[in-house]
């Protein structure tokens, strides 16, 4: 099985124990590590952070001791903006320039492939996204002719039903991608006005009608029905939780909220907590399991957080094995307890390790 793990370059800027550099990563933990994110400047793939080149080197030296490890560079992301991607993909010349710039950049910096993180193509971009993928793959095949190992091509796709319908020609893009990471998280957010788990495995009794498509099982099944081969589908598992501030004494699933949860000490983003911050939060919190959805949530005071733990990730891995998927994807290594100092197990990357162990289990 593949274990595809994202590393985010901006995690270096977190304070103190939250700061994560690629040299802190475990070279034997994942089969693929994806560095997020690269930029596109003047239609050419480019660095984003001032020290990206240094960090690329740090990451790719992990392969010295583990030659089986593959590294990919992810281009795009939330801050890149869908509109910018749209302009490049929809213009034949811009698209060609971008595609041509990719292989030399990846080779220069020691990457084994490219991950496309266009978040997200609109319905008007659907055809252009397919063309971008098809042409990128053709370029990779051509570039590998002189006996080089062919560069890998993957894409991170939304698990939201409306986005899947609007953005992706699943059957066509699947033909050209080496694997597809389906982002089976962020199904539920503060915009709903109630508590809810952002990455349930199944729908569960707790979900009202609007949420019938907002679960991992549905998204995976729908992708397969739309023509994605199971052998290319990698299922996303988050090492972060989504938090809410409760608006009343109700604390269950569907309780009213006043907004996102308070920011974490290190990640500093309202409504999001890294797993290592959740481990801190759990001290003195009340933990519940949403049985139908097979995921936990915890409450403390007026704070509510839905997250994944070692038990839930094992359920998810068993599910993806039952579905005969290609493996699991983790967002993100730097949100797991990468130092092993927060979750009281003397184990670095406890969630990702639990996923790895479950994948290896017979």
């Amino acid at each position: 099985y593949k274990l595809v793990c994202y590393y985010t370059s901006w995690s270096q800027y977190r304070e103190g124990d939250g700061s994560c550099f690629p040299d802190a990563l475990d070279r034997f933990l994942c089969t693929h590590i994806i560095y997020s994110f690269a930029n596109i400047s003047n239609d050419h793939i480019d660095t984003w952070e001032w020290n990206d080149v240094t960090l690329y080197g740090m990451l790719n030296t992990l392969k010295n001791r583990n030659p089986n490890l593959k590294t990919l560079l992810s281009v795009g992301g939330w801050n890149f903006g869908s509109q910018r991607f749209s302009k490049i993909a929809s213009n034949t010349q811009s698209r060609r320039t971008f595609i041509k710039s990719v292989p030399p950049f990846l080779r220069t910096h020691g990457f084994d492939g490219l991950d496309l993180a266009w978040l997200y193509p609109g319905r008007r971009d659907k055809q252009h996204f397919t063309t971008l993928i098809k042409e990128m793959k053709a370029e990779f095949i051509k570039e590998a002719q002189p006996g080089k190992k062919q560069l890998l091509l993957s894409a991170a796709l939304s698990a939201g039903k409306v986005t899947i319908d609007s953005s992706y020609d699943i059957a066509k893009i699947s033909q050209h991608l080496d694997f597809i990471s389906i982002m089976t998280y962020d199904f539920h957010g503060a915009w709903r006005g109630t508590t809810g788990h952002h990455s349930p495995l199944f729908r569960g009794q707790e979900d009202a009608s609007p949420d019938r498509f907002s679960n991992t099982d549905y998204a995976v099944g729908y992708m397969l029905r739309l023509g994605a081969p199971a052998s290319k589908l990698v299922m996303g598992i988050p090492t972060f939780g989504r938090s809410f501030t409760l608006a009343s004494s109700e604390t269950g699933v569907g309780a009213p909220i006043s907004g996102p949860g308070i920011p974490g000490r290190f990640t500093k983003e309202a409504g999001t907590l890294a797993y290592y911050e959740i481990c801190d939060f759990l001290r003195g919190a009340t933990v519940h399991r949403i049985l139908g959805q097979q995921v936990p949530y915890a409450t403390k005071g007026n704070q509510w957080v839905g997250y994944d733990d070692q038990e839930s990730v094992k359920s998810k891995v068993q599910y993806l094995k039952d579905r005969q998927l290609a493996g699991a994807m983790v967002w993100a290594l730097d949100l797991d307890d990468f130092q092993g100092s927060f979750c009281g197990q003397d184990l670095r990357f406890p969630l990702t390790n639990a996923i790895k162990d479950a994948l290896a289990a017979t």
Partner: antibody
Framework: QVQLVESGGGVVQPGRSLRLSCAAS????????MHWVRQAPGKGLEWVAV????????DYADSVKGRFTISRDNSKNTLFLQMNSLRAEDTAVYYC?????????????WGQGTTVTVSS | SYELTQPPSVSVSPGQTASITCSGD??????ASWYQQKPGQSPVLVIY???KRPSGVPERFSGSTSGNTATLTISGTQAMDEAAYYC??????????FGGGTQLTVLG
């Protein structure tokens, strides 16, 4: 407010052609997908054709494929349906309808309709 | 033949709850929308994405979906609700498809 006004309907003989228009106002026409939906006398609604916001993408119901052509002129805020080789079963009220092209698959605004009668 | 099946007619007394169903395999994977059409008028969207109500549509209109069946519920039905109701969905293979329509009659 959003307004869609169809025109161009009438009585036409089988095998002949007709061109329907839909004048749009009250919204940014060039940002929306547009559809034609028809309703035969005493019958239900039948989707006919769709065109993307910029006219680059079109799709048709099997019953009209090869005979009808949907088009638009964004500079004039107008949608068209060119109907060729008309048949008796094309007799219906034809509505133009709007669709928020980025994320929706339903019709949030409809015109009042224009009647097409195909009869010898 | 319709991909979406609706009962041809439903009758209800004023003030009572009317339920109109719409069934079809595509509803397992697709959102249902509902339209109201009064005689001589064009259709009006009353429910989209299974349960969402456009602004201006009275709260007595609600939608739900379970499995392959979508339901439009009108609670406290009024005489003005007498109309034909159509369900609609989109599918990658069938594009936009409507149910055959249900005539709601408000008795009395």
């Amino acid at each position: 407010q959003v307004q869609l006004v169809e025109s161009g309907g009438g009585v036409v003989q089988p095998g002949r052609s007709l061109r329907l228009s839909c004048a749009a106002s009250g919204f940014t026409f060039s940002s929306y997908g547009m559809h034609w939906v028809r309703q035969a006398p005493g019958k239900g609604l039948e989707w006919v054709a769709v065109i993307s916001y910029d006219g680059s993408d079109k799709d048709y119901a099997d019953s009209v494929k090869g005979r009808f052509t949907i088009s638009r002129d964004n500079s004039k805020n107008t949608l068209f349906l060119q109907m060729n080789s008309l048949r008796a079963e094309d007799t219906a009220v034809y509505y133009c309808a709007r669709d928020d092209y980025d994320s929706t698959y339903y019709f949030d605004n409809w015109g009042q309709g224009t009647t097409v009668t195909v009869s010898s | 033949s319709y991909e979406l099946t609706q009962p041809p007619s439903v009758s209800v007394s004023p003030g009572q709850t009317a339920s109109i169903t719409c069934s079809g395999d595509i509803l397992a994977d697709q959102y249902a929308s509902w339209y109201q059409q009064k005689p001589g008028q064009s259709p009006v969207l009353v429910i989209y994405h299974d349960t969402k109500r456009p602004s201006g549509v009275p709260e007595r209109f609600s939608g739900s979906t379970s499995g392959n069946t979508a339901t439009l519920t009108i609670s406290g039905t009024q005489a003005m609700d007498e109309a034909a109701y159509y369900c609609q969905a989109w599918d990658i293979n069938t594009a936009w498809v409507f149910g055959g329509g249900t005539q709601l009659t408000v008795l009395g």
